[in-house]
Interface confidence: medium
Amino acid sequence: LPAQVAFTPYAPEPGGTCRLREYYDQTAQMCCSKCPPGQHAKVFCTKTSDTVCDSCEDSTYTQLWNWVPECLSCGSRCSSDQVETQACTREQNRICTCRPGWYCALSKQEGCRLCAQLRKCRPGFGVARPGTETSDVVCKPCAPGTFSNTTSSTDICRPHQICHVVAIPGNASMDAVCTSTSPTRSMAPGAVHLPQPVSTRSQHTQPTPAPSTAPGTSFLLPVGPSPPAEGSTGD
C-alpha cells in the first residue's frame, strides 16, 4: 500500500489486498469499506466515494461484514415439528431445530430443513442405537433371554425375569411369567431403561419440510462487486 493512502476508498498496489473489513471493488478498482452485520450496501463505492450502508429491513439480516446490495430474507416461521431456537434479527437468521422425539432428516447450514419422527421399535425389538439430533433410532431384535413389550423410541431389550418355576416362558416380546411369588431379575450388562422423551406422540404424523431459505453463504458472494482476495476477508 502506498504510504499516502489511508482512508477508503483507495487504490491498492496492483494485485495487493485490501485491509480487514474492506473489499476490492473491481469496477471502481478501489479498496472500499464493507458494511457491518445488520446492514447492507445501499450504494456501492466509486473512485471518489465510499460504500454507503443502510440497516436491514424487518425480517431480513446480514450476519457478516459484507457488501451485498440487499439483506438476506430470514427463513419463514418454524413448522409444527420444530422449535425456534434463534429468533430472526437484523444480524442473524431464524434457526429452527426439531422437537423432542424428532430428528433432523435434512439439515441446512444452520438449523433443520426437514424433521422426521424418531423410529419406534415395536415389541420384540429394542433400541440398538438411540436417536440423536441428526440421526434416527436403530432397532434390533431382542436376543434370546431378553424382551421388549413396548412400541418405543427409547426402550432397550430387557432381560427376562428368572423364575424358580416358570409358568409361561418369555420370548422376544414378552417377559417370562413365574409361578413363584419372588422372581429375580437378571442383571445383564446394559440393562438400563432409557429416559422417556419430554413429549411423545401416539400416532406417526407425516413430517413437513421447513421452507427453504437463501443459502447462508450468499452474503459472501454478492452479484455486484467482486469478492475480496483470500487474506483480506474476515472480520
Partner: antibody, heavy 116, light 107 residues
C-alpha cells in the same frame, strides 16, 4: 507464482471465428477484473474492454462492441475472448491482463492472423 | 474518449543519460495513469501506477510524476536493458486508453 497462460497462435480465414483462452493461476481468479488488449503488428496498445470475474459482466470499448465477446469459466479460472466475422484488420496479438488500474500481470499474447 | 498523447515519438539517448518521457491527457484523469515498458516480442510490463507509485520489483531509477493532464516518466540513468517502447495509459474513465508509445533507442 501468478501466471496468465494464453492459447496458441491461430490462422483464420475472413468471416471465421476465433476463441482465445487465458488460464489464470497463482491467485484468486474472481478477485481481479480481466482486461483484454489488442496490438496490431507494429502498432500500439488498444484497450478492448474487461470482464468482471465475479459477476461475469463484460464491458467493451466502442470499437470492440458487436463482434467481440468476453466470457469466463470460473471453475477452471479461465477467461475467453471470442471474435466473430473475422476481417484482415483483426490480425493482431491479443493479450489478457489482470486488473484495470495498473495492469500488473499479462498473458504472453496470442497472435491471430486473418488471411485468405 | 480521453486521448493520451505521448512525446516524443522517438527518443535517442546513450546509456547513463537521463530520459524524460511525456504523456498528456485530453481531459483530467486525476492520477489514474500507469506506465508500461514493452520490448520486441514480449508482453508489456507495469512500471508505474497511480502516476507516481513504482510497482514491486521496478528499479528506483524509474519514477513517475504528474496529475490531472500532464504526466512524466523519468529514467534517471539509462541502462542497456531500458531501451524499449514505453506506453502510458489512463484508467480513469471508459474507454481506458493508451498513448501511442515512445520508442527509447540507443543513440
Amino acid at each position: 507464482q501468478i501466471q496468465l497462460v494464453q492459447s496458441g497462435a491461430e490462422v483464420k480465414k475472413p468471416g471465421a471465428s476465433v476463441k482465445v483462452s487465458c488460464k489464470a493461476s497463482g491467485y484468486t481468479f474472481t478477485t481481479y477484473g480481466m482486461s483484454w488488449v489488442r496490438q496490431a503488428p507494429g502498432q500500439g496498445l488498444e484497450w478492448m474492454g474487461w470482464i468482471h470475474t465475479y459477476s461475469g459482466v463484460p464491458t467493451y470499448a466502442d470499437d470492440f462492441k458487436g463482434r467481440f465477446a468476453f466470457t469466463l469459466d470460473t471453475s477452471t479460472s479461465t477467461a475467453y475472448m471470442e471474435l466473430r466475422s473475422l476481417r484482415s484488420d483483426d490480425t493482431a496479438v491479443y493479450y489478457c491482463a489482470r486488473g484495470l488500474y495498473g495492469v500488473d500481470y499479462w498473458g504472453q499474447g496470442t497472435l491471430v492472423t486473418v488471411s485468405s | 474518449e480521453i486521448v493520451m498523447t505521448q512525446s516524443p515519438a522517438t527518443l535517442s539517448l546513450s546509456p547513463g543519460e537521463r530520459a524524460t518521457l511525456s504523456c498528456k491527457a485530453s481531459e483530467n484523469v486525476v492520477t489514474y495513469v500507469s506506465w508500461y515498458q514493452q520490448k520486441p516480442g514480449q508482453a508489456p510490463r507495469l512500471l508505474i501506477y497511480g502516476a507516481s507509485n513504482r510497482y514491486t520489483g521496478i528499479p528506483a531509477r524509474f519514477s513517475g510524476s504528474g496529475s490531472a493532464t500532464d504526466f512524466t516518466l523519468t529514467i534517471s540513468s539509462l541502462q542497456p536493458e531500458d531501451f524499449a517502447v514505453y506506453y502510458c495509459g489512463q484508467s480513469y474513465t471508459y474507454p481506458y486508453t493508451f498513448g501511442q508509445g515512445t520508442k527509447l533507442e540507443i543513440k
